[in-house]
């Protein structure tokens, strides 16, 4: 065995997406000799780590190693042994950890330190764990979907049928919804990006892109729900919260301490005369929608146009891929079809939210009640965010494509992140200098 085993003619990469509600491990594969070609990297495995997001381990960091074991062992099974030491591993933490860092930098560092130590114990080329910025999350999501759709390629695409075919090289915008944040990223049409914080310049495969991006922290679906509850309990006359975003007959007790645990509810915090309150669902889409709209401050805009909370948003342009929770929620609600108009989506949401909780539980017996109970809120929130938050209209709704996977690879920031860190997106047409990581940071 005095010779290193000849490496396979393929390479692998691993990215862990440490989100606010859970962690997922993605394994990517590509032909070694075609690293700089567009569209050659594809996902071969996704492993969802059992348990919550890493930010929840703040009081039990010693459990992080065990938490990551199953998926890391899965990676050892999927990737040939001869490739392990050459396979880079990256962990990117998103808004859940951004929120923890806001509360305590020391606690966030401790969690990341234990994560790093756990991952470095595996026989891979571990390249570090870090909290990525909201801007990076948006940018990498945009790169992922456009890479997979072949939008950066001047030559024939490597796959036969491209979904969402637009017969041109115009890039797709990216709409990403997580548990704690949401990102909107696209190339505006001949529009100055008035806010420098929202502007990104890329040169990819010999073409320049001026990209708008913004990440709304606290506006992921889970944190938006906490915000809404914190806002609504302020005006409740007692410890009963009659909530239109939950099905009629649904009941759940919420601890006030849990409600105020997240920085996202700080603006609504007040001393309440009770330690717990009970949510009682009344299942009314319209009222739920109205309640959600109160989370978006649209009264102030220092720019020519804003999304909400004074954040610049250029006029929407082109087609958009809506992924992550945008897709999962709409898929559950059976609303991802290109043929379903915005009016139809709204109608179906009205009917869904009005269904009694007992009926819903029977219809979806295989779904965990915690998740099942929140689809009315999440679906309504998605409509509110897209229509009132980002200013999509009934007409432009047809330009939103709810995407789970493209050619077998999940839509999301992880692929774009790996492509960048492994220098697989050249600035010029291959064979030229790859784009440096600093372009994004």
């Amino acid at each position: 065995t005095q010779n290193k085993a000849l490496p396979e003619n393929v390479k692998y990469g691993i990215v862990l997406d440490a989100g606010s509600s859970h962690t997922s491990l993605y394994i990517y594969k590509w032909p070694a000799e075609k690293e700089n070609d567009t569209g050659v990297v594809h996902q071969v495995e996704e492993c969802r780590v059992k348990g919550p997001g890493i930010s929840k381990f703040v009081q039990k960091v010693n459990e992080i190693g065990i938490y990551l074991t199953d998926c890391m062992e899965r990676a050892r099974e999927v990737i040939p042994r001869s490739q392990h030491q050459e396979t880079p591993v990256y962990l990117g933490a998103t808004a859940g950890m951004r929120l923890l860092r806001m509360e305590s930098e020391e606690l966030a560092d401790r969690v990341l330190d234990v994560v790093e130590r756990s991952l470095s114990n595996y026989p891979f080329d571990f390249q570090g764990a870090r909290i990525i910025t909201g801007q990076e999350e948006g940018a990498y999501g945009w790169i992922t979907i456009n890479y997979l759709l072949g939008k950066f390629s001047q030559k024939t695409r490597w796959f036969s049928i491209v979904p969402y075919e637009t017969n041109n090289q115009e890039t797709f915008g990216a709409l990403d919804l997580g548990g704690a944040s949401t990102q909107v990223t696209f190339v505006p049409q001949n529009q100055t990006i008035e806010s420098p914080d929202n502007a990104l310049q890329f040169r990819l495969y010999g073409k320049d892109y001026n990209v708008y991006t913004h990440s709304f922290l606290c506006y992921g679906k889970d944190q938006a729900l906490w915000q809404k509850l914190a806002k609504d309990i302020q005006v409740a006359s007692n410890e009963i919260l009659r909530d239109p975003c939950f099905h009629p007959g649904y009941k759940k007790v919420v601890n006030v301490s849990d409600l105020y645990k997240t920085p996202c509810t700080k603006r609504f915090e007040m001393t309440l005369p009770f330690q717990q309150f009970e949510i009682q669902g009344i299942g009314n889409y319209q009222q739920c929608h109205q309640s959600i709209l109160e989370l978006f401050n649209t009264s102030y805009c220092p720019y020519s146009q804003c999304a909400f909370n004074g954040i610049f948003l250029p006029p929407l342009q082109g087609d958009f891929g809506a992924f992550s929770a945008f897709y999962f929620v709409m898929k559950f609600l059976n609303l991802t079809s290109e043929k379903v108009s915005q009016e139809k989506v709204t109608e179906m949401m009205k009917k869904f939210c009005a269904q009694p909780w007992e009926e819903i539980k029977t219809s979806y017996a295989g779904v965990k009640e915690k998740y099942l109970s929140e689809y009315c809120f999440s679906g309504t929130y998605i409509l509110s965010l897209l229509l009132q938050g980002y200013h999509f209209t009934a007409d432009s709704w047809e330009h939103i494509h709810f995407i789970g996977k493209i050619q077998g690879s999940d839509a999301g920031w992880t692929l774009g992140y790996m492509l960048n860190l492994t220098n697989m997106i050249p600035a010029e047409q291959p064979l030229s200098t790859p784009l440096s990581h600093s372009t994004y940071v």
């Epitope: 065995t1 005095q2 010779n3 290193k4 085993a5 042994r81 001869s82 392990h84 030491q85 470095s120 114990n121 026989p123 080329d125 571990f126």
Partner: antibody, heavy 121, light 107 residues
């Protein structure tokens, strides 16, 4: 010919320090994870620790028995592996082997001849 | 950590006989188990890697088997030079650990 040659062993008092070296030749040293394994007199083999590559930020891992006292380092330009041993105890008395795996990982297909460390007052 | 238990501690056999050495892991380690031979005053020598993979230069009479927690090193017909101490090693996860060894002696 692939070769590992250890040096630096000797007699040291408890609480003292010693630095072992391992000179590598016959292979591209910088491309391989390197390890130290020891064997106390009349006893079995015990893994001491490993050091990975520059691309892995020279990451190190140690056996619990030496953690905080021993430090593994490498100088790729000199093709040399080091083991810095501090706060030595009598139970650290052993033959110390420098070892690596030239094929895959976490087994040892190349060994040095070993260097003897004796910790005694 | 993964604990490896080798049995028997000592095995007395004659040249030409078949030797069967056992190694048991405290938890499943798939096939990440390696075997070494050590003679007095010498460094260990790798015999088998990943439970059953043979190594060029090692006589074909040495073979390995097993997966999960139970592993076996077999020497089909003992030669005089095979009498030595044999160690198994966990190559699955850190810390890397060795079994206590089996001493194979001439009967």
């Amino acid at each position: 010919e692939v070769q590992l040659v250890e040096s630096g062993g000797g007699l040291v008092k408890p609480g003292g320090s010693l630095r072992l070296s391992c000179a590598a030749s016959g292979f591209t040293f910088s491309k391989y994870w390197m390890n130290w394994v020891r064997q106390a007199p009349g006893k079995g083999l015990e893994w001491v620790g490993e050091i990975r590559l520059k691309s892995n930020k020279y990451g190190t891992h140690y056996a619990e028995s030496v953690k905080g006292r021993f430090t593994i380092s490498r100088d790729d330009s000199k093709n040399t592996l080091y083991l810095q041993m501090n706060s030595l105890k009598t139970e650290d008395t052993a033959v110390y082997y420098c070892t690596t795996q030239l094929d895959l990982y976490w087994f040892f297909d190349v060994w040095g001849q070993g260097t003897t460390v004796t910790v005694s007052s | 950590e993964i604990v490896l238990t080798q049995s028997p501690a000592t095995l007395s056999l004659s040249p030409g006989e078949r030797a069967t050495l056992s190694c048991r892991a405290s938890q499943s380690i798939s096939d990440y188990l390696h075997w070494y031979q050590q003679k007095p005053g010498q460094a260990p020598r790798l015999l088998i890697y990943y439970a059953s993979q043979s190594i060029s230069g090692i006589p074909a009479r040495f073979s390995g088997s097993g997966s999960g927690t139970d592993f076996t090193l077999t020497i089909s017909s003992l030669e005089p030079e095979d009498f030595a101490v044999y160690y198994c090693q966990n190559g699955h996860s850190l810390p890397l650990t060795f079994g206590g060894g089996t001493k194979l002696e001439i009967k």
